[in-house]
């Protein structure tokens, strides 16, 4: 389970993104950002610093469908 506001790195970060984003999928750099393709957007934010659930969700690929 995701523990808020912690450092997440490597496979643990990938697992957490899969958990948070589910079927939506995810990416490591937001498409709208000016960060280069190989720059580690979420890695810098979540591994080298710390991140919360809201920040993680910004890296999910598509918005969750509302029922």
């Amino acid at each position: 389970a995701y523990r808020p506001s912690e450092t997440l790195c490597g496979g643990e970060l990938v697992d957490t993104l899969q958990f948070v984003c589910g079927d939506r999928g995810f990416y490591f750099s937001r498409p709208a950002s000016r960060v280069s393709r190989r720059s580690r957007g979420i890695v810098e934010e979540c591994c080298f610093r710390s991140c919360d659930l809201a920040l993680l969700e910004t890296y999910c690929a598509t918005p969750a469908k509302s029922e």
Partner: antibody, heavy 122, light 107 residues
Framework: EVQLLESGGGLVQPGGSLRLSCAAS????????MNWVRQAPGKGLEWVSS????????LYADSVKGRFTISRDNSKNTLYLQMNSLRAEDTAVYYC???????????????WGRGTLVTVSS | DIQMTQSPSSLSASVGDRVTITCQAS??????LNWYQQKPGKAPKLLIY???RLQSGVPSRFSGGGSGTDFSLTISSLQAEDFATYYC?????????FGQGTNLEIK
Amino acid sequence: EVQLLESGGGLVQPGGSLRLSCAASGFTFSVYDMNWVRQAPGKGLEWVSSISSSGGGTLYADSVKGRFTISRDNSKNTLYLQMNSLRAEDTAVYYCARDSDTSSYYWYYDLWGRGTLVTVSS
Amino acid sequence: DIQMTQSPSSLSASVGDRVTITCQASHDISNYLNWYQQKPGKAPKLLIYAASRLQSGVPSRFSGGGSGTDFSLTISSLQAEDFATYYCQQSYSFPRTFGQGTNLEIK
């Protein structure tokens, strides 16, 4: 040629300081996270510190936290390790290592320097 | 921290032999496992990442397997240049820990 070249090692007394450098060439240094890994004589490999591609984030092993500082100058394609309050147990060969990119969502050190020896002794 | 335990610590073998080194993680690390080769006085060299993916330029006699907590590195037919020390490393979480190494010697 793609390579990393460390320098700055040497003999230093306990409590002393040393600054290691790692010059990168042959690749776009500024897009890779970088690392320092050390190896005490006759021992195994130990991760020491990591720095994000921008230099905005850093991580340290508990054994060096508060004593070592990792930094980088992307304009000079150079990685640094400032080592203060050195102890005998810091004696090791220090390697700089490049992190993999995120193309496969896996992490590994795909390029290593030849290492520089740091000896802490009175 | 995740502890990585390699076995055996040392191994004697002959050219042409098939050799397997194992690595065990103290926690489930999925397939976030790398293998490195190091020769005396040289820097480590990446052989395998993601448990089983061969790094570019590494001979196909090297192969990796496993998932979760148990992993292996196999050399199908030892060559003279393969005598070295081998390390496993997990990249599931920080700190990225290494195994203690397996020294592969000539019998």
